[in-house]
């Protein structure tokens, strides 16, 4: 079925929501004053070999649990990330965007990445897909 302008708009809005969530996480942790940043950087994330289509979001979905675990370290009294809620929201968006009709086997790059590199990769992906839709 060919995508309609309304379905394209919905996809764009979901991607923008995903982008904002990922940017919020990155801005929240990638602060040189963050006492836990160096220790958060010791955690490794798997990166997609290829990420150019919505189906490749499967690779992001599979890394959401490890992401939540690292984000549990990032909370403070004045900075409420609420990792479980945030990851749950991202998961819902990712499931809607990638669709559940086709099962896609994610292929990962050989090199692992830090949380900052991981987030930047998926931010770039979201921006790239949004730009093709607008």
């Amino acid at each position: 079925m060919a995508p309609t302008s309304s379905s394209t708009k919905k996809t764009q809005l979901q991607l923008e929501h995903l982008l904002l969530d990922l940017q919020m996480i990155l801005n929240g942790i990638n602060n040189y004053k963050n006492p836990k940043l160096t220790r958060m950087l010791t955690f490794k994330f798997y990166m997609p070999k290829k990420a150019t289509e919505l189906k490749h979001l499967q690779c992001l979905e599979e890394e959401l649990k490890p992401l939540e675990e690292v984000l549990n370290l990032a909370q403070s009294k004045n900075f409420h990330l609420r990792p479980r809620d945030l990851i749950s929201n991202i998961n819902v968006i990712v499931l809607e965007l990638k669709g559940s009709e086709t099962t896609f086997m994610c292929e990962y790059a050989d090199e692992t990445a830090t949380i900052v590199e991981f987030l930047n990769r998926w931010i770039t992906f979201s921006q790239s897909i949004i730009s093709t839709l607008t």
């Epitope: 006492p35 220790r39 010791t42 909370q75 900075f79």
Partner: antibody
Framework: EVQLVQSGAEVKKPGESLKISCKGS????????IEWVRQMPGKGLEWMGV????????YYNEKFKGQVTISADKSISTAYLQWSSLKASDTAMYYC??????????????WGQGTTVTVSS | AIRLTQSPSSFSASTGDRVTITCKAS??????????MNWYQQKPGKAPKLLIY???NLESGVPSRFSGSGSGTDFTLTISSLQSEDFATYYC?????????FGGGTKVEIK
């Protein structure tokens, strides 16, 4: 019971290599970072570095970078601290400790009993 | 690196005394409303033991006579009524910035 058990005391000569260990039990070893702390005779405590046993990722105090290597084998729940060429100034008590950083905390809640390293010709 | 200065470096006290140890940081150890300051007790030949974390939180199993307070650069460890098992060296530690640093220690001896 959550505990960290370190290897026994070592007496070495300058220039020799050494690898001391820290074995965790009573908890999911891969889920907590392990840090190493030095205490020279009659002195205070100095943080050396940290390892994530789950990923192998490390971070060192600049003072100890290139002087020691921190590693881990998660299959046997053990972290290591090693020297390729010991100096007399490496004589100290070395502690491993478990880092806790959930929420808005960051502290060491469990410590090993310490490993005494004596380097003398 | 953040320097932590403890005072006094040592002193003598009697069982039942109220003891106060201070720790002054060379810069603030607060981040977004939280104080990254911890206190440890070390007895001769033993590993340090956590007493207080995040400036004022009592570690599980630690007697309530121990308490911590402070924020920014000035912190205090208080023992409300010194017991015989409390004679030891006490260290403050900041975990706000790498490298984590410890104070020089305060040795509490029997008078």
């Amino acid at each position: 019971e959550v505990q960290l058990v370190q290897s026994g005391a070592e007496v070495k000569k300058p220039g020799e290599s050494l690898k001391i260990s820290c074995k965790g039990s009573g908890y999911a070893f891969s889920n907590y970072l392990i840090e190493w702390v030095r205490q020279m005779p009659g002195k205070g405590l100095e943080w050396m570095g940290v390892i994530n046993p789950g990923s192998g990722g490390t971070y060192y105090n600049e003072k100890f970078k290139g002087q020691v290597t921190i590693s881990a084998d998660k299959s046997i729940s053990t972290a290591y601290l090693q020297w390729s060429s010991l100096k007399a100034s490496d004589t100290a008590m070395y502690y491993c400790a478990r880092w806790r950083g959930e929420g808005y905390y960051a502290y060491y809640d469990v410590w090993g009993q310490g490993t005494t390293v004596t380097v003398s010709s | 690196a953040i320097r932590l200065t403890q005072s006094p470096s040592s002193f003598s006290a009697s069982t039942g005394d109220r003891v106060t140890i201070t720790c002054k940081a060379s810069q603030s150890v607060d981040y977004q409303g939280d104080s990254y300051m911890n206190w440890y007790q070390q007895k001769p030949g033993k590993a340090p033991k956590l007493l207080i974390y995040a400036a004022s939180n009592l570690e599980s199993g630690v007697p309530s006579r121990f308490s911590g307070s402070g924020s920014g650069t000035d912190f205090t460890l208080t023992i409300s009524s010194l017991q015989s098992e409390d004679f030891a060296t006490y260290y403050c530690q900041q975990s706000n910035e790498d490298p984590y640093t410890f104070g020089g220690g305060t040795k509490v001896e029997i008078k």
